[in-house]
Interface confidence: low
């Protein structure tokens, strides 16, 4: 199910108290960037910056809280955006070296 889009970046004084709260902040920021460009969700040129920012945000806070990255919660966020934003995309980026290569409807991109 989609993550809630309400909430604040942190608790008292704006400080992020835990990783769950931080992830929610990352997601809210990402949604703020993605919602206005819904018609371009399958255009990598348009969504590359918010997508990369989301990953950077999740990774930054993971390091801040001394967690590995990706961790299960971060992975759920990534998977969530595939389900919500990229489920109807059919085009696949050709290179394995870019994060968006896995942005496709089936979510699967491994080759034997």
């Amino acid at each position: 199910q989609p993550l809630p889009t309400t909430g604040t970046p942190g608790s008292e004084g704006g400080t992020v108290k835990n990783y769950e709260t931080a992830v929610q902040f990352c997601w809210n920021h990402y949604k703020d960037q993605m919602d206005p460009i819904e018609k371009d969700w399958c255009d990598w040129a348009m969504i590359s910056r918010p997508y990369s920012t989301l990953r950077d945000c999740l990774e930054h806070f993971a390091e801040l809280f001394d967690l590995g990255f990706p961790n299960p919660l971060a992975e759920r966020i990534i998977f969530e955006t595939h389900q919500i934003h990229f489920a109807n995309c059919s085009l696949v980026q050709p290179t394995f070296s870019d994060p968006p290569e896995d942005v496709r409807g089936s979510h699967h991109h491994h080759h034997h």
Epitope: N18, Y19, E20, V23, E59, A62, E63, F65, D66, L67, G68, F69, P70, N71, P72, L73, E75, R76, I78, F79, T95, F96, S97, D98, P99, E101, D102, H107, H108, H109, H110, H111, H112
Partner: antibody, heavy 119, light 115 residues
Framework: QSVEESGGDLVKPEGSLTLTCTAS?????????ICWVRQTPGKGLEWIGC????????PYYASWAKGRFTISKTSSTTVTLQMTSLTAADTAAYFC????????????WGPGTLVTVSS | DGVMTQTPSSVSAAVGSTVTISCQAS????????LSWYQQKPGQPPKLLIY???SLASGVPSRFKGSGSGTQFTLTISDLECADAATYYC???????????????FGGGTEVVVK
């Protein structure tokens, strides 16, 4: 896009060995987990551990592997598995496998490399 | 670490029939669906069939179907073919949100013999 293991050998009990997983046609650096799995002769698959290919990635290990096994990313296309204090029970085919996100399963596997521990 | 209990350990079935393999996790898998199924033939590495419990991997026939959630999962192979003779493994990912626990486990395997 493929991966291949190397370094399998005959080693004496209590010895050490380092296996290498090398990627061809792609880089581990972004969005990839690189995992090690072993299979003893005629037996099932056993998960050893994984490491994230990104700069901040840390390894995760099965509880039985902690201490004796070390997974390291040595370059954007190579990951190693260091094994110490080997016993006959460690005799197995060792596979390197990759996945972009944990839930997606290991979509790419190497052919495996054989490690034999015997005196 | 979590434990995956796979049943049966072996099954024999006729061409054209249906085979069902079960996999039970000792605790809920991550996101309730981080469960994959693999097919392995002698001398070969495993081949991914199903991921996230029910998604079909690229190039895998729709005769293979995965289902389940949480701790109980099933692989169903319908219209069994001779080429389906192999050992099948389930594999899950455990993890607690926001922690560095990230563990995987394989089931013991199920040998499918096609008559």
């Amino acid at each position: 896009q493929s991966v291949e293991e190397s370094g399998g050998d005959l080693v004496k009990p209590e010895g050490s060995l380092t296996l290498t997983c090398t990627a061809s046609g792609f880089s581990f650096s972004i969005s990839y987990w690189i995992c090690w799995v072993r299979q003893t002769p005629g037996k099932g698959l056993e998960w050893i551990g994984c490491i994230y290919g990104g700069s901040s990635g840390r390894p995760y290990y099965a509880s039985w592997a902690k201490g004796r096994f070390t997974i390291s990313k040595t370059s954007s296309t190579t990951v190693t598995l260091q094994m110490t204090s080997l016993t006959a029970a460690d005799t197995a085919a060792y596979f390197c496998a990759t996945t972009a996100y944990g839930g997606y399963g290991y979509g790419t596997w190497g052919p495996g490399t054989l490690v034999t521990v015997s005196s | 670490d979590g434990v995956m209990t796979q049943t049966p350990s072996s099954v024999s079935a006729a061409v054209g029939s249906t085979v069902t393999i079960s996999c039970q996790a000792s605790q809920s898998v991550f996101s309730n669906n981080y469960l994959s199924w693999y097919q392995q033939k002698p001398g070969q590495p495993p081949k991914l069939l199903i991921y996230t419990a029910s998604s079909l991997a690229s190039g895998v026939p729709s005769r293979f179907k995965g289902s389940g959630s949480g701790t109980q999962f099933t692989l169903t192979i319908s219209d069994l073919e001779c080429a389906d003779a192999a050992t099948y493994y389930c594999q899950c990912t455990y993890g607690k949100s926001g922690t560095d626990t990230y563990l995987n486990a394989f089931g013991g395997g199920t040998e499918v013999v096609v008559k």
